[in-house]
């Protein structure tokens, strides 16, 4: 069967969708790929919790899965001929969308070494137990299945879609229904974050009565890294309800006028944004969130902040503190690189000295230069070294081969050398289009 029921969770800059259906790993990846994503990564405990949430949502909708121990494909696979590496967290497996090897793993049991066939990873769910954040689904590896034969207990798969940013859900100040259509062709009425390029259809009214108005918005980038719908004020407002319906759709305070009209407001230390609904801190840097040598930088319109590090340092995983950058990893030096706090130092090998074109360059030391030659007679400079020679009738001698000694002729002959919606996938991209547009055969344009 194909992929059926789906659930969706959007958080940060990614959305996860869970699908039921007995598909092979390749068919599941193709399904995710068609909509601009990949089988999901589980690169951290936090990501494992997001994936667990979307699976829990799917299981609430799905009436009955056939197996007590159900498996859902994720995007971790090992190609045929690539062997198990027990020393690595991913054991030699890699994420289908590419990306770095990550330290997080949650294997179900010790893996058997088998290089003769491709192996794929699924999440193992014990449906007899409730899904708890403390009990994250284990990783189970096995055959990748084939069309019509997905593998034992395979009940579905999880996709991941990455975005430039997300919009807040639209605020309704009165009765109505919002339907979001995402770029990965999922429709939902309840998303805690709505991905860039999603469309929102708002139908105002009580439902059974005639709808009074409808609105259409797109989640777009309004300014650099500022994602918004472009709607102004709460939607579907009704004098009948005033602030009593969903706090008037206001983020913080709702103020009613005598005629049933109302305005949104903000608590002290906050200000109302252009959408006339949302409140943002007047200065998120005032609480000094950045630590160590990090400086707090306000985002546009004072909406958010980012910590910034001095040169030679970078933000740690908390994004609040600075750690030294190992500049030597980028090989900035021609020869030897020594990492130092906040910087680095280039050094040259024996036989070389600092100099030449470019930063960190080394040039050959001319050991044969006048007054410097270590040779008793002839001296020839070479790259990084030198060699001595002797006049006719003499041969090189001495432990270091710099001296010349006479040849006894009576004894006989002594004898180295790469030149605007968009989804993001590793190594490629997939172009996507806004609702109402279709991807052209060239895979780039929208028509």
């Amino acid at each position: 069967t194909g992929a059926d029921t789906e659930a969706v969770v959007c958080v940060g800059t990614a959305c996860y969708t869970a699908h039921s259906g007995k598909l092979s790993a390749a068919e599941a990846q193709n399904h995710c790929n068609q909509n601009g994503g990949n089988l999901a990564t589980v690169k951290s405990k936090e990501e494992a919790q997001h994936v667990q949430r979307v699976l829990a949502q799917l299981l609430r909708r799905e009436a009955a899965l056939t197996a007590r121990m159900s498996k859902f494909w994720i995007g971790l696979q090992r190609e045929k001929g690539k062997c198990l590496d027990p020393s690595l967290p991913l054991k030699g497996f890699s994420w289908v969308g590419g990306g770095e090897d990550t330290p997080y793993s949650n294997w179900h049991k010790e893996l058997r070494n088998s290089c003769i066939s491709k192996r794929c990873v699924s999440l193992l769910l014990d449906l007899s137990q409730p899904l708890l954040p403390s009990r994250l689904p284990k990783w189970s590896e096995g055959p990748c299945g084939s069309p019509g034969s997905p593998g034992s207990n395979i009940e579905g798969f999880v996709c991941k879609f990455s975005f430039k940013g997300m919009c807040r859900p639209l605020a309704l100040g009165g009765p109505g229904q919002v339907t979001y259509t995402t770029p990965f062709q999922t429709t939902s009425s309840s998303l805690e974050a709505v991905p860039f390029a999603s469309a929102a259809n708002v139908a105002c009214g009580e439902g059974d009565k005639d709808e009074t108005q409808s609105h259409y918005f797109l989640c777009k980038e309004k300014a650099p890294d500022v994602f918004d719908w472009g709607s102004s004020g709460p939607l579907c407002v009704s004098p009948k309800y005033g602030c009593n319906f969903n706090n008037g759709g206001c983020h913080q305070d709702c103020f009613e006028g005598g005629d049933g009209s109302f305005l949104c407001g903000c608590r002290p230390g906050f200000r109302l944004l252009d959408d006339l609904v949302t409140c943002a801190s007047r200065n998120p840097c005032s609480s000094s969130p950045c630590r160590g040598g990090a400086t707090c930088v306000l985002g546009p319109h004072g909406k958010n902040y980012t910590c910034r590090c001095p040169q030679g340092y970078q933000l740690d995983s908390s994004q609040l503190d600075c750690v030294d950058v190992d500049e030597c990893q980028d090989s900035p030096c021609a020869q030897e690189c020594v990492n130092t706090p906040g910087g680095f130092r280039c050094e040259c090998w024996v036989g070389y000295e600092p100099g030449g074109p470019g930063e960190g360059a080394c040039q050959d030391v001319d050991e044969c230069a006048l007054g410097r030659s270590p040779c008793a007679q002839g001296c020839t400079n070479t790259d990084g070294s030198f060699h001595c020679s002797c006049e006719e009738g003499y041969v090189l001698a001495g432990e270091d081969g710099t001296q010349c000694q006479d040849v006894d002729e009576c004894v006989g002959p002594g004898g180295p050398l790469c030149d605007s919606l968009c989804f993001n996938t590793q190594g490629s991209f997939h172009c996507g289009c806004l609702p109402g547009w279709v991807l052209a055969p060239n895979g780039v344009s929208c028509t």
């Epitope: 259409y216 797109l218 890294d225 546009p300 289009c433 806004l434 547009w437």
Partner: antibody, heavy 118, light 112 residues
């Protein structure tokens, strides 16, 4: 290739309105912001608004708010700029300009000269 | 609104010489994402402006590499390393960090 073709020059009386069109081709019209910029004779450039044709979302320079209306017709990939209550200082060349993914104004229309004179 | 001051108003440089145009903003254009939203445009007589440099230092498609952009959060420079006759134009800096987008007053570049 991307092209923005604007309507012809206009001569208007003070107090009247003018509507300039900008027909886009060669790209997904609905997916890019379309900006309007004007340039008075011998003067610099002044941004006065933009529209996102996908959903009609608009932003205006506060200096012109209330006098300018931006609209877009997705079916013909055409954007319109209407400026009302014209005065002599509105005499300028009006450009429509596409905003790209890097927030640059990458493609410009040829410009429409609007002359306001009694 | 973010205000900008472009200098000089006009500039005369000999062919083959270096030309430098400056732009100063009332607020840092460095976004918390590390990108500086500063742009340079070139306008020749009777033509619409043309994008030269985006995000402070990136050359737009088809722009000769004698053009370069540099700067910090508030102070920026457009440099033409070796002036050519076809570079005679008015140059504008602009910011696209915060609405309303704003332009500098322009610098008229001529040949000495």
């Amino acid at each position: 290739q991307v092209q923005l073709v604007q309507s012809g020059a206009e001569v208007k009386k003070p107090g009247s309105s003018v509507k300039v069109s900008c027909k886009a081709s060669g790209y997904a019209f609905s997916s890019y912001w379309l900006n309007w910029v004007r340039q008075a004779p011998g003067q610099g450039l002044e941004w006065f608004g933009r529209i996102y044709p996908g959903d009609g979302d608009t932003d205006y320079n506060g200096k012109f708010k209330g006098r300018v209306t931006l609209t877009a017709d997705k079916s013909t990939s055409t954007a319109y700029m209407e400026l009302s209550s014209l005065r002599s200082e509105d005499t300028a060349v009006y450009f429509c300009v596409r905003g790209d993914g890097y927030w640059a104004m990458d493609y410009w229309g040829q410009g429409t000269t609007v002359t306001v004179s009694s | 609104d973010i205000v900008m001051t472009q200098s000089p108003d006009s500039l005369a440089v000999s062919l083959g010489e270096r030309a430098t145009i400056n732009c100063r903003f009332s607020k840092s254009l460095l976004h918390s994402n590390g990108i500086t939203y500063l742009y340079w445009y070139q306008q020749k007589p009777g033509q619409p402006p043309k994008l030269l440099i985006y995000q402070m230092s990136n050359l737009a498609s088809g722009v000769p590499d004698r053009f370069s952009g540099s700067g910090s959060g508030t102070d920026f420079t457009l440099t033409i390393s070796s002036l050519q006759a076809e570079d005679v134009a008015v140059y504008y800096c602009a910011q696209n960090l915060e609405l309303p987008w704003t332009f500098g007053g322009g610098t008229k570049l001529e040949i000495k």
